[in-house]
């Protein structure tokens, strides 16, 4: 089941996944001046069997200016900034990530992809938090959040992390000194906004049907 809300936002912190559970979707997004090829994929999907997981489909971007080329256009200044992802790209990847059953690695970049990656996580996904540069982590518990299904609704647990404005950065798991954390984990106060049972995309007629605007008759 997809987790319809995003992981919680922690002031002065970012999150990332170390590996992606099977079923995770990654939108095919292109940077400015490029678009998805019309016959191409809408998203990549983490799929697999008992022994191996990988990203199915391939995202492809083509120049918006021409039909059948992937020629580079001069990037706008705001596009020249380092590519970011929803979970914050990081060069460090735990060595055991690839062997985690039922999970995919961070997918490799594709040509002319957008600066931000949009993932749709699934129930059971865990993300890890770290304070941004210039902030230090004060842990009251695990600096992680898990998407859980409770009473038919998906929700993310609340990470027990506070980032204070001191010039010292914390690291992702594996790079920080172990810290004592209280037993148990307080659950998020806000439950997921979306479920397939209590959520509807509303379809409705346009509320007003002004003849001059909305209707035209053949003479």
């Amino acid at each position: 089941e997809l987790c319809d809300d995003d992981p919680p936002e922690i002031p002065h912190a970012t999150f990332k996944a170390m590996a992606y559970k099977e079923g995770t979707m990654l939108n095919c997004e292109c940077k400015r001046g490029f678009r998805r090829i019309k016959s191409g994929s809408l998203y990549m999907l983490c799929t697999g069997n008992s022994s191996h997981s990988s990203w199915d489909n391939q995202c492809q971007c083509t120049s918006s200016a021409t039909r059948n080329t992937t020629k580079q256009v001069t990037p706008q200044p705001e596009e020249q900034k380092e590519r970011k992802t929803t979970e914050m790209q990081s060069p460090m990847q735990p060595v055991d990530q690839a062997s985690l059953p039922g999970h995919c690695r961070e997918p490799p970049p594709w040509e002319n992809e957008a600066t931000e990656r949009i993932y749709h996580f699934v129930v059971g996904q865990m993300v890890y938090y770290q304070c941004v540069q210039g902030y230090r982590a004060l842990h009251r518990g695990p600096a992680e959040s898990v998407c859980k299904m409770t009473h038919g609704k998906t929700r993310w647990t609340q990470p027990q992390l506070i980032c204070t404005g001191e010039m010292e950065t914390s690291q992702f798991p594996g790079e920080e000194k172990p810290q004592a954390s209280p037993e148990g984990r307080p659950e998020s106060e806000t439950s997921c906004l979306v479920t397939t049972t209590d959520f509807q995309i509303q379809t409705e007629m346009a509320a007003t049907m002004e003849t001059s605007i909305f209707t035209t008759e053949y003479q």
Epitope: E29, S39, L42, I118, H120, L193, F199, I201
Partner: antibody, heavy 103, light 106 residues
């Protein structure tokens, strides 16, 4: 017949701009027909060849709403129209809008 | 476009029966096959996506297949299962549907 019409589909409780939205037609007593989709994040659209040029799909992400529009209705457009979010499949559906075209 | 062919178009069964609906794609769609249930006057409801049963859908529903041939099985038909079932490929756009299978009470 001949009139224009726009129906709307409002999403709530999720990041509307980040999911494709599709439109499906169901004529009376018939099956489901996939009309087309739009990605509200950048307004990329894809149409089924059967509906290309017959309808226009658009979206306004600022109000989390997608639209299906006809410039000139025909009697054969009489049907139930559903919008749906594209997740693993079309995972969340609207309740549908009945469009009846008669002279 | 990929053409999806469902069979049978309708079937009559009794409560407790095992029911199997098949769907064939005109070309390989890997495991990108979805199943929907629709009851009269209601919107369709996704019950199976790729190889995953949707949360909240009873375990008597199961799906199988890969490539071009797929099946939806209801192990023990219940009164609430009488409906029309549609397969749909989500391998490539347009995401085409099968023509539907109506499951009626015998």
């Amino acid at each position: 017949p001949g009139e224009s019409l726009q129906i709307s589909c409002k999403g709530s409780g999720y990041k509307f701009a980040n999911y494709w939205i599709g439109w499906v037609r169901q004529m009376p007593g018939k099956g489901l027909e996939w009309m087309g989709i739009i990605y509200p994040g950048d307004s990329d659209t894809r149409y089924s060849p059967s509906f290309q040029g017959q309808v226009t799909i658009s979206a306004d992400k600022s109000i989390s709403t997608a639209y299906l529009q006809w410039s000139s209705l025909k009697a054969s457009d009489t049907a139930m129209y559903y919008c749906a979010r594209l997740g693993w499949g079309m995972d969340v559906w609207g309740q549908g809008t009945t469009v009846t075209v008669s002279s | 476009d990929i053409v999806m062919t469902q069979s049978p178009s309708s079937l009559s069964a009794s409560v407790g029966d095992r029911v199997t609906i098949t769907c064939r794609a005109s070309q390989s769609i890997s495991s990108y096959l979805n199943w929907y249930q629709q009851k009269p006057g209601k919107a369709p409801n996704l019950i199976y996506a790729a190889s995953s049963l949707r949360s909240g859908v009873p375990s008597r529903f199961s799906g199988s297949g890969s490539g071009t041939d797929f099946t939806l099985t209801i192990s023990s038909l219940q009164p609430e299962d009488f409906a029309t079932y549609y397969c749909q490929q989500s391998y490539s756009t347009p995401w085409t549907f099968g023509q539907g299978t109506k499951v009626e009470i015998k």
